[in-house]
Interface confidence: low
């Protein structure tokens, strides 16, 4: 594939931010703010938590999530998985793109200890028009939202 | 706003590195090396710790800081905040852009245990000409500088 | 240096993924998958673990490694170093570009505790044609490979 950056075209880019509605508890991907504050879409669209590609090419995709808690709640997995996943019409299941596993609870030596951790992912992937990228965190109960600066999701064509 | 990448224009980019003078202890932002070693400025300028935008557009901005210590010094907050902040003529206060909170001290179970941690932030934001971006770390006493490779700050237009 | 992005040229980019052969145990850099799955090379080449630059310019280079273990093996350094290094024909030794140090073992308070951590590095550096960039992790015994999504290495011209 030859991908050229035309000088007269706007380069697709987006930055979506965490909001109170991001965590659904439904087992689905995180949802994002697309318009308010620092959030924007330029040459990409959004649907139900997903960045939707309108122009095929190589994209640097990234996400950060802010994790935090007090000790480790009972029943909470000791491993937190934060990942970027692709949904494509050509394949029935989500495909892992970039994934991190962390054990932040292990930092808290007493059950009442407050802890914070952050997970950042970024990398270049090829995306076709119509393909979607989503962010998932398992267990999402540890994601700490505030003002859109601590948990976010974005992409730009390279 | 339509932002075009003109084929004859240099794309703004910068990478600033940590130096002995980075930590001022004054409550201000971190200061950076702009010329020596790996540091450079291309189409961006620098003033008192800030990357200064000369051309409006969307920028991927990033920073990494190396944290480290021996146990947790008394009086040291258990939470470290590392953030990228915008200063704009249109608003009197700094605006949070990208922020992380971490509790690295919690890893050291004894007071004499040496620990290291790293915090990385990156994301796309829109910046107008004249706006400035700075890096802050609270508590900056935990930032470990060496040779410019472990703590740094940069940006490029996307 | 004036670096122009010509509208008719393909912008160099690459994303290399971790594979079973990545960890050599030889003290050398990590090796990477260049073709299968998510891996690709576009305007860059690869040799013995290194991304090789064919066109001089400023590149955003990045790497993530997935770390994990059960407690801390005897003889294992308490500090893990993850770095991107440059090899240049003009200098006999590797040059540190971007480096992180972490103490993930410190999270595990008992010797049988499973822990996970992730290290991400990214930043803009200038690279000449013929120069090479490699990833090193010390101690690489803690790098956990799976399917190319958890440990990776990439770059693109900015």
């Amino acid at each position: 594939l030859i991908q050229e950056r035309r000088s007269h075209e706007v380069n697709p880019a987006a930055h979506l931010t965490g909001a109170n509605s991001s965590l659904t508890g439904s087992g689905g991907p995180l949802l994002w703010e697309t318009q308010l504050g620092l959030a924007f879409l330029r040459g990409l669209s959004y649907h139900d938590g997903a960045l939707v590609v309108t122009k095929a090419g190589y994209y640097y995709i990234y996400s950060k999530v802010q994790l935090g808690g007090v000790g480790c709640p009972l029943g909470l997995a000791s491993t937190i998985t934060h990942g970027l996943y692709k949904r494509t019409p050509r394949y029935p299941e989500e495909l892992e793109l970039l994934v991190s596993q962390q054990s932040p609870c292990g930092r808290a030596t007493s059950s009442s200890r407050v802890w914070w951790d952050s997970s950042f992912l970024g990398g270049v992937v090829h995306l076709e028009a119509g393909e979607k990228v989503v962010v998932r965190v398992l267990d999402e109960r540890l994601v700490r939202l505030r003002d859109g600066t601590r948990s976010y999701f974005g992409a730009f064509m390279v | 706003l339509i932002q075009e990448r003109r084929s004859h224009e240099v794309n703004p980019a910068a990478h600033l590195t940590g130096a002995n003078s980075s930590l001022t202890g004054s409550g201000g932002p971190l200061l950076w090396e702009t010329q020596l070693g790996l540091a450079f400025l291309r189409g961006l300028s620098y003033h008192d710790g800030a990357l200064v935008v000369t051309k409006a557009g969307y920028y991927y901005i990033y920073s990494k800081v190396q944290l480290g210590g021996v146990g947790c010094p008394l009086g040291l907050a258990s939470t470290i905040t590392h953030g990228l902040y915008k200063r704009t003529p249109r608003y009197p206060e700094e605006l949070e852009l990208l922020v992380s909170q971490q509790s690295p001290c919690g890893r050291a179970t004894s007071s004499s245990r040496v620990w290291w941690d790293s915090s990385f932030l990156g994301g796309v934001v829109h910046l107008e000409a004249g706006e400035k971006v700075v890096v802050r770390v609270l508590d900056e006493r935990l930032v470990r500088l060496r040779d410019g490779t472990r703590s740094y700050f940069g940006a490029f237009m996307v | 240096l004036i670096q122009e992005r010509r509208s008719h040229e393909v912008n160099p980019a690459a994303h290399l993924t971790g594979a079973n052969s990545s960890l050599t145990g030889s003290g050398g850099p990590l090796l990477w998958e260049t073709q299968l799955g998510l891996a690709f090379l576009r305007g860059l080449s690869y040799h013995d673990g290194a991304l090789v630059v064919t066109k001089a310019g400023y590149y955003y280079i990045y790497s993530k490694v997935q770390l994990g273990g059960v407690g801390c093996p005897l003889g294992l350094a308490s500090t893990i170093t993850h770095g991107l290094y440059k090899r240049t024909p003009r200098y006999p030794e590797e040059l540190e570009l971007l480096v992180s140090q972490q103490s993930p073992c410190g999270r595990a308070t008992s010797s049988s505790r499973v822990w996970w951590d992730s290290s991400f590095l990214g930043g803009v550096v200038h690279l000449e044609a013929g120069e090479k960039v490699v990833v090193r992790v010390l101690d690489e015994r803690l790098v956990r490979l799976r399917d190319g999504t958890r440990s990776y290495f990439g770059a693109f011209m900015v």
Epitope: V10, T34, Q35, L36, G37, L38, F40, L41, R42, G43, L44, S45, Y46, T54 | L1, I2, Q3, K86, R90, Y91, P92, L95, L97, V125, H126, L127, E128 | -
Partner: antibody, heavy 122, light 107 residues
Framework: QVQLQQSGPELVKPGASVKISCKAS????????IHWVKQRPGQGLEWIGW????????KYNEKFKGKATLTADTSSSTAYMQLSSLTSEDSTVYFC???????????????WGQGTSVTVSS | DIVMTQSHKFMSTSVGDRVSITCKAS??????VAWYQQKPGQSPKLLIY???TRHTGVPDRFTGSGSGPDFTLTISNVQSEDLADYFC?????????FGSGTKLEIK
């Protein structure tokens, strides 16, 4: 120069629908939000919602969900607002206006159409 | 919803005078406030955004100030063509809301 040219006055019957248009010129239509604002005589301004023509994403004031439907045709640089199930409460002037999305934080409405008067009468 | 209160429905002034029109937000909106002028039979025109930044082409006799809940539009050296309704608007959160307007009358 930037212009938003709205369609002419409408006289419609109660219960019917009406679709009013807003043709943009002098700027890149797909790079700005188009908002719609209602102004009843002698009263203030009420925000109805916006559409971003670049991706057909819409945002509505909860109060107008089900009442207003916003669409856009990028080929003609025209935004539309359809009002359904009309009652006398809908008799008023409607403005389209644009908002620059090019800054990192949202902005104000910098250019406005001349307004379209809708009269609901049997 | 954030309520923008313009307590004066009418204000009377003379040519050459200075007048201040106020607007109070029911919640903190930072400086995400705009001011619009609407002359009789016309559509609104943007005067001020980000509480204090003049829009292109707006005469410098129009000045915006304030942050948090309290905002002021000041017109110094009032001219006869300034006869109009003035509306404040917050764009800090949805739904976007406007003040009820202040009608400036020239004596």
């Amino acid at each position: 120069q930037v212009q938003l040219q709205q369609s002419g006055p409408e006289l419609v019957k109660p219960g019917a629908s009406v679709k009013i248009s807003c043709k943009a010129s002098g700027y890149s239509f797909t790079s700005y939000y188009i908002h719609w604002v209602k102004q009843r005589p002698g009263q203030g301004l009420e925000w109805i919602g916006w559409i971003f023509p670049g991706s057909d994403i819409t945002k509505y004031n909860e109060k107008f969900k089900g009442k207003a439907t916003l669409t856009a045709d990028t080929s003609s640089s025209t935004a539309y607002m359809q009002l359904s199930s009309l009652t006398s409460e809908d008799s008023t002037v409607y403005f389209c206006t644009r908002e620059d999305y090019g800054i990192s934080t949202y902005s104000a409405m910098d250019f406005w159409g001349q307004g379209t008067s809708v009269t609901v009468s049997s | 919803d954030i309520v923008m209160t313009q307590s004066h429905k009418f204000m009377s002034t003379s040519v050459g005078d200075r007048v201040s029109i106020t607007c109070k937000a029911s919640q903190d909106v930072g400086t995400a406030v705009a001011w619009y002028q609407q002359k009789p039979g016309q559509s609104p025109k943007l005067l001020i955004y980000w509480a204090s930044t003049r829009h292109t082409g707006v005469p410098d006799r129009f000045t915006g100030s304030g942050s948090g809940p309290d905002f002021t539009l000041t017109i110094s050296n009032v001219q006869s063509e300034d006869l109009a309704d003035y509306f404040c608007q917050q764009y800090s959160s949805y739904p976007l809301t406007f003040g009820s307007g202040t009608k400036l009358e020239i004596k």
